[in-house]
């Protein structure tokens, strides 16, 4: 009685169960009554990452330097190449097909999380007591200067974009 279902890592063809090709290999010939499935290794620039019956291997991803990409991990016959972005850039999407420059946090905002090759800069508004007076992809909000510790007094209040201005205390004669 010909099978209607096959074991794991097998497939049904011509009323018989044939072994799938292992990762890194493609299908050349289905099994016969006399021989196992014939599989061939993927070439150097190709891969297959699952047990399969594919007749063609997939091309490794190309990390195009013109799109700001570089190789993070070279592909093997069983894995695709992993691309990442050059310094100062991050992936536009999860598939990382191109890169864009990290955004800078405007004055009044500081860096909460520095960008990586795959994620953009995360900015946060400077809370009371902190400020940022620059547009930067690295700088956090800085605390206002403490006039008291310098034996000075606040002459001008700070904002989220400016530091306080300290001055000497008025001495009563």
């Amino acid at each position: 009685e010909p099978p209607t279902a096959c074991r794991e890592k097998q497939y049904l063809i011509n009323s018989q169960c044939c072994s799938l090709c292992q990762p890194g290999q493609k299908l050349v010939s289905d099994c016969t009554e006399f021989t196992e499935t014939e599989c061939l290794p993927c070439s150097e620039s190709e891969f297959l990452d699952t047990w399969n019956r594919e007749t063609r291997c997939h091309q490794h991803k190309y990390c195009d330097p013109n799109l700001g990409l570089r190789v993070q991990q070279k592909g093997t016959s069983e894995t695709d190449t992993i691309c990442t972005c050059e310094e100062g850039l991050h992936c536009m999407s999860e598939s990382c097909e191109s890169c864009v420059p990290h955004r800078s946090c405007l004055p009044g905002f500081g860096v909460k999380q520095i960008a990586t090759g795959v994620s953009d800069t995360i900015c946060e508004p400077c809370p009371v007591g902190f400020f940022s007076n620059v547009s930067s992809a690295f700088e956090k909000c800085r605390p206002w200067t403490s006039c008291e510790t310098k034996d000075l007094v606040v002459q001008q209040a700070g904002t989220n974009k400016t530091d306080v201005v300290c001055g000497p205390q008025d001495r009563q004669r």
Partner: antibody, heavy 112, light 113 residues
């Protein structure tokens, strides 16, 4: 219908070489592994080589490794066996087979 | 190498219409990890090339009469001919195609008693 027709056998001196051919028809040749099996007069059958459907993989027993080379031309539905450094014990009828079907054989005689 | 041992070793005398049974034992298991067992039976009539009777232990090849049946597993296999006819006479070989080098049994000659 399926037909396998061997040729190329003959009388050869020890140390000599021959190239056997097998013309296949009546089935999808490239889908099947093919083998050569030999039989000395009055003896049992002996498998001597196999080539996978694509021609990429080849297999031999130790007795012929390095002396025999199996190959195939899928475009022309032809199987080959190159035999070299022949010895008297290689004298036999050589059959081409898909295991399901066999040719009539070609006789190789190694004698001084 | 896997040695295939057939019995009876030389000949099996039978009367036409009788049942005949040939045994084949492999020196190690010829079952692959995926469950396949490439055990075949061939008949070689006098002056002819071998003909396939049974493949994968128990599957009759197309055109082979149903009086031929194969059975067995692991290392022990059997070919049965339920009612021997004159055209069944010749040498029967078992063959394992599971592990390289592939090997044949020594052959059993079926002849008239």
């Amino acid at each position: 219908q399926v037909k396998l027709e061997e040729s190329g056998g003959g009388l050869v001196k020890p140390g000599g070489s021959l190239k056997l051919s097998c013309a296949a028809s009546g089935f999808t040749f490239r889908n099947y592994a093919m083998s050569w099996v030999r039989q000395s007069p009055g003896e049992r059958l002996e498998w001597v080589a196999e080539v996978s459907g694509s021609g990429y993989y080849t297999y031999y027993p130790d007795t012929v490794t390095g002396r025999f080379t199996i190959s195939r031309d899928n475009a022309n539905n032809t199987l080959y066996l190159e035999v070299s450094s022949l010895r008297s014990e290689d004298t036999a009828m050589y059959y081409c087979t898909s295991r399901a079907y066999w040719g009539q054989g070609t006789l190789v005689t190694v004698s001084a | 190498d896997i040695v295939m041992t057939q019995s009876p070793t030389l000949s099996l005398p039978v009367s036409l219409g009788d049942q005949a049974s040939i045994s084949c034992r492999s020196s190690q298991s010829i079952v692959l990890t995926n469950g396949n067992t490439y055990l075949e039976w061939y008949l070689q009539r006098p002056g002819q090339s071998p003909k396939l009777l049974i493949y994968k232990v128990s599957n009759r090849f197309s055109g082979v009469p149903d009086r031929f049946s194969g059975s067995g597993s692991g290392t022990d296999f059997t070919l049965k001919i339920s009612r021997v006819e004159a055209e069944d006479l010749g040498v029967y070989y078992c063959f394992q195609g599971s592990h390289v080098p592939y090997t044949f049994g020594g052959g059993t000659k079926l002849e008239i008693k």
